[in-house]
């Protein structure tokens, strides 16, 4: 597994990570940590593992956290109720 750096699919990344689009270069995917408490997220980001190529630059939230709306267009990882 690639612990950090370029990837193509989730299976190439270590635990607690996903293969997300780089925020600097859209054509590159990098192993990215899953969302921690308070991190920005998107509720439709594919769960881990995803067997295709992601389009989002964020990973889903860590287990035990959910991607919840805090305002009209803002979602963050919060503890599941």
């Amino acid at each position: 597994a690639v612990i950090t750096g370029a990837c193509d699919k989730d299976s190439q990344c270590g635990g607690g990570m996903c293969c997300a689009v780089s925020i600097w270069v859209k054509s590159i995917r990098i192993c990215t940590p899953m969302g921690k408490l308070g991190d920005s997220c998107h509720p439709l980001t594919r769960k881990v593992p995803f067997f295709g190529r992601r389009m989002h630059h964020t990973c889903p939230c860590l287990p035990g956290l959910a991607c919840l709306r805090t305002s009209f267009n803002r979602f963050i990882c919060l503890a599941q109720k």
Partner: antibody
Framework: EVQLVQSGAEVKKPGASVKVSCKAS????????MHWVRQAPGQGLEWIGY????????TYNQKFKGRVTITVDKSTSTAYLELSSLRSEDTAVYYC??????????????WGQGTLVTVSS | DIVMTQSPDSLAVSLGERATINCKAS??????????MNWYQQKPGQPPKLLIY???NLESGVPDRFSGSGSGTDFTLTISSLQAEDVAVYYC?????????FGQGTKVEIK
């Protein structure tokens, strides 16, 4: 060749439940999510929900929450849609459709032939 | 829910001419520079068929006379040169917010 083969037409009474099956072949079943969509006679398309065939996690259209259950049997590569408390407005063709794995663009690239569910007293 | 409104409801075009279908979302379906909009074709008695995903990406095996464009709330499906086999109903679908919602459909016929 990817194929999704659905179960046959059903006629149900109001208040009853129906369970529609969708048997997949020609690809690795657990690598792709499965959606369910319905189409009332002469009407447009309505998304019901989808399931991760790998993990079994589901996302439902809130309109159907509490009445719909989507499940998979990995051993037979089959997805199921169960809809309870049927009413006449549920009369429709129900389709299963494979997600194409195009990242977060949840696009349905292969569809079953459809199952007509008629709800009538 | 995001409401998708297609125009026109129906369209009659001569063979070989251009057909244009519009789809307007009640709010933006963009995220992080991508547009989360798909287009499907449905012929009578058949299930829908995916044509375009993520606004402008042509599905494998779909003729290149089909193209998609747009961003934000306004999207277009174009058939550059209408063929007899393109007679169908076309649907847009947003996939940026749950529940995924479809437009009401646009019927394309031969003039």
């Amino acid at each position: 060749e990817v194929q999704l083969v659905q179960s046959g037409a059903e006629v149900k009474k109001p208040g009853a439940s129906v369970k529609v099956s969708c048997k997949a072949s020609g690809y690795s079943f657990t690598d792709y999510d499965m959606h369910w969509v319905r189409q009332a006679p002469g009407q447009g398309l309505e998304w019901i929900g989808y399931i991760s065939c790998y993990a079994g996690a589901t996302t439902y259209n809130q309109k159907f929450k509490g009445r719909v259950t989507i499940t998979v049997d990995k051993s037979t590569s089959t997805a199921y849609l169960e809809l309870s408390s049927l009413r006449s407005e549920d009369t429709a063709v129900y389709y299963c459709a494979r997600d194409g794995n195009y990242g977060e663009a949840y696009a349905m690239d292969y569809w079953g032939q459809g199952t007509l569910v008629t709800v009538s007293s | 829910d995001i409401v998708m409104t297609q125009s026109p409801d129906s369209l009659a075009v001569s063979l070989g001419e251009r057909a244009t279908i519009n789809c307007k979302a009640s709010q933006s379906v963009d995220y992080d520079g991508d547009s989360y909009m798909n287009w499907y074709q449905q012929k009578p008695g058949q299930p829908p068929k995916l044509l375009i995903y993520a606004a402008s990406n042509l599905e494998s095996g779909v003729p290149d006379r089909f193209s998609g464009s747009g961003s934000g709330t306004d999207f277009t499906l174009t058939i550059s040169s209408l063929q007899a086999e393109d007679v169908a109903v076309y649907y847009c679908q947003q996939i940026n917010e749950d529940p995924f919602t479809f437009g009401q459909g646009t019927k394309v016929e031969i003039k």
